[in-house]
Amino acid sequence: DAHKSEVAHRFKDLGEENFKALVLIAFAQYLQQCPFEDHVKLVNEVTEFAKTCVADESAENCDKSLHTLFGDKLCTVATLRETYGEMADCCAKQEPERNECFLQHKDDNPNLPRLVRPEVDVMCTAFHDNEETFLKKYLYEIARRHPYFYAPELLFFAKRYKAAFTECCQAADKAACLLPKLDELRDEGKASSAKQRLKCASLQKFGERAFKAWAVARLSQRFPKAEFAEVSKLVTDLTKVHTECCHGDLLECADDRADLAKYICENQDSISSKLKECCEKPLLEKSHCIAEVENDEMPADLPSLAADFVESKDVCKNYAEAKDVFLGMFLYEYARRHPDYSVVLLLRLAKTYETTLEKCCAAADPHECYAKVFDEFKPLVEEPQNLIKQNCELFEQLGEYKFQNALLVRYTKKVPQVSTPTLVEVSRNLGKVGSKCCKHPEAKRMPCAEDYLSVVLNQLCVLHEKTPVSDRVTKCCTESLVNRRPCFSALEVDETYVPKEFNAETFTFHADICTLSEKERQIKKQTALVELVKHKPKATKEQLKAVMDDFAAFVEKCCKADDKETCFAEEGKKLVAASQAALGL
């Protein structure tokens, strides 16, 4: 449905509040270094212009595309070249190349200060003084640090953020009310950002077909009673939504996501019995709820898959006539029967099935050739099952912190060239799989664990892509989206790595460590552990454990000392010397 003015169309569909919020998110995700005030000014100008177009769709420039309008606005920023360097060259291009150029300059790890949470009273005062500015600032700060955050979902987070302050700033104990809510929003926000980053990477690096395959598998697990045609329709619509959001088309994305939620709720009888509660909620909550809804029960008496996909005489005919549709049907049928499998495992099975048909359907006796294809699935299923069993046992034995440390050592030995902050961040997140998934029964462990690991390893991939240092990381990240985790799991110690020179400064600690939170202190210790492995990649677990135990004792001792700084200086030297001796440095 063509509209004379796209900007007027979206303004009317979304309403002024959502329109302004989404334009702010879009601008902050593109120009991540720009001050808040500059963005607010740009947003207000765009909003005023949109209103003139609503009043008269034939007014000057109202017929321009959103990319043209937004890009022109971004290119008016005076300090573009000083602040962003070569990104300013994007402004010399025409659409659609200009938007592609802006997208390529999105930075997954922008050089921005860590967000420090002010005192509760300070936050509540700011909230009461100017609620609108306070909430815009939240959108801005999250969007610029997470340039692929799913925009309509960020509106949902902002709504919850507002609700937390509205409730807690009136509470008797403001901090007790507010801080847990803010912690929860922060943790959920980081998880949401990482999940969306994988969707965008899937679309941008591996194409629409890869994303659609993922969506078929996931939606078929979630909606096993829905017909294949229904799942296919949802997949097509969901792909459009995510393509738009990942492409910076946030107004279209939010509008289409609302339409999709509306469609799902209007057709829930043919989709899932679990949607009733979600569909009674307001729009933002409804969309979020649908995205998180539990898997529906599997229909009873589903026939064997072999009949249609192995035994039928029409397998090769059907495959040849519509390859992707036939593979989609295979994936749908397999996924709806296996909520206990990870999506990536289901995609590996579908890939194996495809490879087999490609080979066998061109053979002299196709049926004889592909008759045993399901036997090839067994090792693919057992590999993640065994890996999860082993790692959950290790997690239960060690606890989260020490399990993270085991992974830190493991991954530093695999890819020691990767920067220490990245190794710490990624290994800590990998380690969280234990508390997140190992508590689940067997039937839920694999989808929880392996699909979570895919999200975390994608963080490694996008951070590494910015400054590539390891061919092994590049290889695992680019060869196959669904085989990333097995690729990293299969990496052994990098024998080509030349150990890092020993630098005592890296292992020098000060009294400020004593005032850090438990989490920050863990990060300091884990940073030291990574550096230790980089100096001595052949160090045994026992050697590393001994050094880390000494280090923990040293920190505890000096934090209890009267003259902490002196203790850190003197005991620190002894610790470094003892560690060097213990590791043979």
């Epitope: 090769c316 005919k317 059907n318 495959y319 040849a320 006539e321 519509a322 390859k323 490609e358 061109a362």
Partner: nanobody
Framework: EVQLLESGGGKVQPGGSLRLSCAAS????????MVWVRQAPGKGLEWVST????????VYAESVKGRFTISRDNAKNTVYLQMNSLRAEDTAVYYC????????????????RGQGTLVTVEP
């Protein structure tokens, strides 16, 4: 809009040969499987042969196996059906077809089809 235009039909004696062609447009031919189906007088649609997008896979109905050969030229957006050793029972209107999104695979009534070309085999 999807268009399929068959040609090459005609009258031929039993044992004779014909080569049917189908020119395609309006869709991505090089990524689409192509099908020949036929309809004998007073009968329903009967599947004849299928060729995959890259021509690596070809499948034939038992009734034509060893006599008919399907092929394609992706550079010319054309699919062919070489028919040898023709029999009276091969008399039919031959349609070239391709999968239509949303239809069931093998449900040829729902596929995109051309107007057809008549093949008559009689002494």
């Amino acid at each position: 809009e999807v268009q399929l235009l068959e040609s090459g039909g005609g009258k031929v004696q039993p044992g004779g040969s014909l080569r049917l062609s189908c020119a395609a447009s309006g869709f991505t031919f090089s990524t689409s499987g192509m099908v020949w189906v036929r309809q004998a007088p007073g009968k329903g649609l009967e599947w004849v042969s299928t060729i995959s997008d890259d021509a690596r896979i070809t499948v034939y109905a038992e009734s034509v196996k060893g006599r008919f050969t399907i092929s394609r030229d992706n550079a010319k957006n054309t699919v062919y059906l070489q028919m040898n050793s023709l029999r009276a029972e091969d008399t039919a209107v031959y349609y070239c077809a391709t999968y239509r999104a949303g239809s069931r695979i093998g449900s040829y009534e729902d596929y995109y089809r051309g107007q057809g070309t008549l093949v008559t085999v009689e002494p």
